[in-house]
Amino acid sequence: SEVEYRAEVGQNAYLPCFYTPAAPGNLVPVCWGKGACPVFECGNVVLRTDERDVNYWTSRYWLNGDFRKGDVSLTIENVTLADSGIYCCRIQIPGIMNDEKFNLKLVIKPAKVTPAPTRQRDFTAAFPRMLTTRGHGPAETQTLGSLPDINLTQISTLANELRDSRLANDLRDSGATIRIG
C-alpha cells in the first residue's frame, strides 16, 4: 500500500524519495510520474533527472533537495484538488529489472481558514505516514507538520536532523529510500 502525504489547496506538497549515490557525482536517473509506477519508466512524467541534471520538468514540479546527493524528493507548488492521487518515484538503476519503485499517495485537502498558528514542535507518531507541507504561496516558505514560519534553510536543517533520527528511519523503511553501491 502507498504511503500517504497530505497538503492543503494553494500550498506546496512534498513527496519524499531518497537514494544514496555509490560515489560523488555518480548519479542514477530518476523519474517522477503521476499515477502508480508501471513495469517500466514512469507514466505521465512530471520530472526527470539524468546522470547530472534535472533535464525535464513541468510547471510547478521541482526538486528542492540536494538531488546530486540523492535527495530526489518532489515539491509540487500551489497544489489544487486535481493534484491528488498516486505519484511514482522511480530510481532507474542500471541493469534489467533493477529499478526501485515507490508509490506515494498525495491527499489534497480544501484550504481552511485557521487562527494564528502556535510555534510548538508537534511531531505526531503518524509523521512517517503523513507529512503535511504548508507554505505562503508558490515557491516561498514551506513548513513541515505544525512548524509555522520556518524558512527553507531551517527546513533543510530540520530535514537533515530528521533523516538522522528514528523517525527518518521509519520514513525510509516505509518505502522511500534506497542505497546504491
Partner: antibody
Framework: EVQLVQSGAEVKKPGASVKVSCKAS????????MHWVRQAPGQGLEWMGW????????KYSQKFQGRVTITRDTSASTAYMELSSLRSEDTAVYYC???????????????????WGQGTMVTVSS | EIVLTQSPGTLSLSPGERATLSCRAS???????LAWYQQKPGQAPRLLIY???SRATGIPDRFSGSGSGTDFTLTISRLEPEDFAVYYC?????????FGGGTKVEIK
C-alpha cells in the same frame, strides 16, 4: 596548483569550424565534469554544454545542438570544444570551466564552476 | 529553460558601503543550485558562492549569499576597492544551465 590552460586566439571565416582545447593540471581530470561557456563582446555568459571527463558522456545546450561537439583525451587531461558552421555571431571568448563534484559528506552535492580557463578569443569574420 | 533576471543592472556605490544584488528565477531552481560569480574586465569569472549560500574556497566573508526557490541575493557587507566588477548569478541544476544578465557594481 589546479589550473585550466586554453589554446590561443583564433580567426575563422564564416562557415568554417574551430576547435578549442583546455588542458587540465593539478587534479584528477577524470573525476570531474568540464563545461564550456562563451561570452560575446560586452555581453553576458552563455553555457554551451558539458562532458563527463570520466565516462565521456556529453550534454549540449539546445541552442548549439548539432553544431557543437565536446570531447576529451584522458591521456592528455585535455578537453576540446569544436564549433562548426561558424557565423559572425559566434565571435566570443570561449571558456572551459571545471565542475567540482563534492564528496557526499560535504554540505552541498555540487560546487558549481570552481576553476575556469583563461579564455580563448574566437573571431569570425569574412 | 529557467530565465534568471538580475537587478539592478548597475549599482553605484562607494567603498565601505553595503551592496545588495538580486537574482530572480522564472521557475524554482532545483536543488537550490545557484551560484554567484565575479568578473573583472579581461578576466575569467571567479566563483564566489555555490548552493545559494556556501562561500567558495578563499572567498572573503564579506560576501554572502541567501535565498531559495526563485529569489536569491548576493550581499557584499563592506565594499573593498577590488570588489567593483560585474556579478553574475547562475543556476546549474536544470539543463540548460543559465546565467543572469549581470549586475555591474561601479564606484560612485
Amino acid at each position: 596548483e589546479v589550473q585550466l590552460v586554453q589554446s590561443g586566439a583564433e580567426v575563422k571565416k564564416p562557415g568554417a569550424s574551430v576547435k578549442v582545447s583546455c588542458k587540465a593540471s593539478g587534479y584528477t581530470f577524470t573525476s570531474y565534469y568540464m563545461h564550456w561557456v562563451r561570452q560575446a563582446p560586452g555581453q553576458g555568459l552563455e553555457w554551451m554544454g558539458w562532458i563527463n571527463a570520466g565516462n565521456g558522456n556529453t550534454k549540449y545546450s539546445q541552442k548549439f545542438q548539432g553544431r557543437v561537439t565536446i570531447t576529451r583525451d584522458t591521456s592528455a587531461s585535455t578537453a576540446y570544444m569544436e564549433l562548426s558552421s561558424l557565423r559572425s555571431e559566434d565571435t566570443a571568448v570561449y571558456y572551459c570551466a571545471r565542475d567540482h563534484v563534492l564528496p557526499l559528506y560535504y554540505g552541498s552535492g555540487s560546487y558549481a564552476f570552481d576553476i575556469w580557463g583563461q579564455g580563448t578569443m574566437v573571431t569570425v569574420s569574412s | 529553460e529557467i530565465v534568471l533576471t538580475q537587478s539592478p543592472g548597475t549599482l553605484s556605490l562607494s567603498p565601505g558601503e553595503r551592496a545588495t544584488l538580486s537574482c530572480r528565477a522564472s521557475q524554482s531552481v532545483s536543488g537550490n543550485y545557484l551560484a554567484w560569480y565575479q568578473q573583472k574586465p579581461g578576466q575569467a569569472p571567479r566563483l564566489l558562492i555555490y548552493g545559494a549560500s556556501s562561500r567558495a574556497t578563499g572567498i572573503p566573508d564579506r560576501f554572502s549569499g541567501s535565498g531559495s526557490g526563485t529569489d536569491f541575493t548576493l550581499t557584499i557587507s563592506r565594499l573593498e576597492p577590488e570588489d567593483f566588477a560585474v556579478y553574475y548569478c547562475q543556476q546549474y541544476g536544470s539543463s540548460p544551465y543559465t546565467f543572469g544578465g549581470g549586475t555591474k557594481v561601479e564606484i560612485k
